[in-house]
């Protein structure tokens, strides 16, 4: 009679994470008598996966009834597969012995590869806001995928970006992998409504890539432009001066009026109007009683936007001239102040 052979017909098996792996094994003879054991790996450090004779293996079930005397099918199923289960599995026949059973013959092994989906990509931008015309870095991370091959692309509003660097770790063999990519994105004045998208394609996703997004509204700061103008007279001794604060984002803005360097009024932007590009406009006005001033008045509109250093625009109100003769300010009437000017 021919000596017993242990046959593992599948050199490799590929299983998606969460599914059940079937590892096939048959013996060519019933002799010698003795149990079958399954191991992952070979040598002294191998890991016991299933022992026909004893032990509790909750994730493992046998394909056939091993208690039947004439059974020669020792295939097993391992449920709820994770990337950590990847490896080479050996079906090993033992010969009954005393006091211990003795290893008799091993199958050639079946390599179990686990296909694991990447986690949803997480995109993060800079720690602080940046202004238009600056290049900022965005990172994208996705974890837990297998096999290692993966494709990552960056987009800004549907346009593919080319300035990025991507790493897949670890470099060597592993049960699962992570990807980390950093893209450089140039901000423009129109980017309040823009999005940066990181797209990950992997064999497990069946052509339906995963996407992570970042809204540039979280990243951009568009500084305002200021314009101070003198409006037509309301009453004989009153002049209305307005400060137009235009094209700013985000909305957080505080405005202070100064008369000859002294604080007259402070207010916070509330009823703003939104532009098509997502930036805001706001107008503040100051009613100046000309009769209360003997000399010319320097009116300054000072704006603190999103916690940045204050910026300002000034306007000289000529008290000596009759209020009705005052027109809009010209560039020559814009004078400096102790703050940075917005223009």
């Amino acid at each position: 009679e021919e000596e017993l052979q242990v046959i593992q017909p599948d050199k490799s098996v590929l299983v998606a994470a969460g599914e059940t792996a079937t590892l096939r094994c048959t013996a060519t003879s019933l002799i010698p008598v003795g149990p079958i054991q399954w191991f992952r790996g070979a040598g002294p450090g191998r890991e016991l996966i299933y022992n026909q004779k004893e032990g509790h293996f909750p994730r493992v079930t046998t394909v056939s009834d091993l208690t039947k005397r004439n059974n020669m099918d020792f295939s097993i199923r391992i449920g709820n597969i994770t990337p950590a289960d990847a490896g080479t599995y050996y079906c090993v026949k033992f010969r009954k012995g005393s006091p211990d059973d003795v290893e008799f013959k091993s199958g050639a092994g079946t390599e179990l590869s686990v296909r694991a989906k990447p986690s949803a990509p997480v995109v993060s931008g800079p720690a602080a806001r940046a202004t238009p015309q600056h290049t900022v870095s965005f990172t994208c991370e996705s974890h837990g995928f297998s096999p290692r091959d993966i494709t990552l692309k960056w987009f800004k509003n549907g346009n593919e970006l080319s300035d990025f660097q991507t790493n897949v770790d670890p470099v060597g063999e592993s049960v699962s992998y992570s990807i980390h990519s950093t893209a450089k994105v140039v901000l423009t004045r129109e980017d309040v409504h823009s999005q940066v998208i990181c797209e990950v394609a992997h064999v497990t996703l069946q052509g339906d890539p995963l996407r992570g997004t970042a809204n540039l509204s979280e990243t951009i700061r568009v500084p305002p432009t200021l314009e101070v103008t003198q409006q037509p007279v309301r009453a004989e001794n009153q002049v209305n001066v307005t400060c137009q604060v235009r094209k700013f984002y985000p909305q957080r803005l505080q405005l202070t009026w100064l008369e000859n360097g002294n604080v007259s009024r402070t207010e916070t932007a509330s009823t703003v109007t939104e532009n098509k590009d997502g930036t805001y406009n706001w107008m503040s006005w100051l009613l100046v009683n000309v009769s209360a001033h003997r000399d010319d008045v320097k009116l300054t509109c000072q704006v603190e936007h999103d916690g940045q250093p204050a910026v300002s625009k000034s306007h000289d109100l000529k008290v000596s001239a009759h209020p009705k003769e005052q027109g809009s300010n010209t560039a020559a009437e814009n004078t400096g102040s102790n703050e940075r000017n917005i223009y």
């Epitope: 720690a127 202004t131 015309q133 600056h134 901000l187 250093p309 940075r340 223009y343």
Partner: antibody
């Protein structure tokens, strides 16, 4: 008071790199951009780029085709400008200057760093 | 890139003279123009920003005007310490660009 203190003069060979530092003090470092401007002997001013220490955002003059790298160390309030693949025409005084973030003029300047490129 | 054409490249004037330097941008730069003064061996010093705003501590004899593409720096009464080179600069679009400079010399 606001101060920008730059590193000392450097002599480099063509093809080498130079790294100039600019240490800021007297204001909130992360609120202002730091710009780099150079001036060749007897010539005018040329803007090289800027970095915003808060966001790490940079803007570059494409004339330098990626030869300029600007970095910042917020723990020491220092900005660095590295210029690689040096050639003789890079011989210049390199200035750092401060500007309020978002298109404002440069109100405080460093003392300048002379970089000489010669074989 | 936006070109800043500054004129004249040099001028000779006497103490007390009114001096005007002009700068023309190759495209609209709104009000985002600054003027700097530079003396030999020194870093530039900001005089005017936002076309017409005087930097803190700068004497009132310096003034700026203009809008769009045409800008002017005026020194109403030239003083001995004003002999230097003056540069205009646009800061609307990167790369920020400077004019070629105007050297103001003693007549």
């Amino acid at each position: 008071q606001v101060q920008l203190v730059q590193s000392g003069a450097e002599v480099k060979k063509p093809g080498a790199s130079v790294k100039v530092s600019c240490k800021a003090s007297g204001y909130t470092f992360t609120d202002y951009e730091i710009h780099w401007v150079r001036q060749a002997p007897g010539q005018g001013l040329e803007w090289m780029g800027d970095i915003h220490p808060g966001s790490g955002g940079t803007a570059n003059n494409q004339k330098f085709k990626g030869r300029v790298t600007m970095t910042r160390d917020t723990s020491t309030s220092t900005v660095y400008m590295e210029l690689s693949s040096l050639r003789s025409e890079d011989t210049a005084v390199y200035y750092c200057a401060r500007a309020v973030s978002g298109y404002y003029a440069m109100d405080y300047w460093g003392q300048g760093t002379l970089v000489t490129v010669s074989s | 890139d936006i070109q800043m054409t500054q004129s004249p490249s040099s001028l000779s004037a006497s103490v007390g003279d009114r001096v005007t330097i002009t700068c023309k941008a190759s495209e609209d730069i709104y009000d985002r123009v600054a003027w700097y003064q530079q003396k030999p061996g020194k870093a530039p010093k900001l005089l005017i920003y936002g076309t017409a705003s005087l930097e803190t501590g700068v004497p009132s004899r310096f003034s700026g005007s203009g809008s769009g593409t045409d800008f002017t720096l005026t020194i109403s009464s030239l003083q001995p310490e004003d002999f230097a080179t003056y540069y205009c600069q646009q800061y609307w679009t990167t790369p920020w660009t400077f004019g070629g400079g105007t050297k103001v010399e003693i007549k």
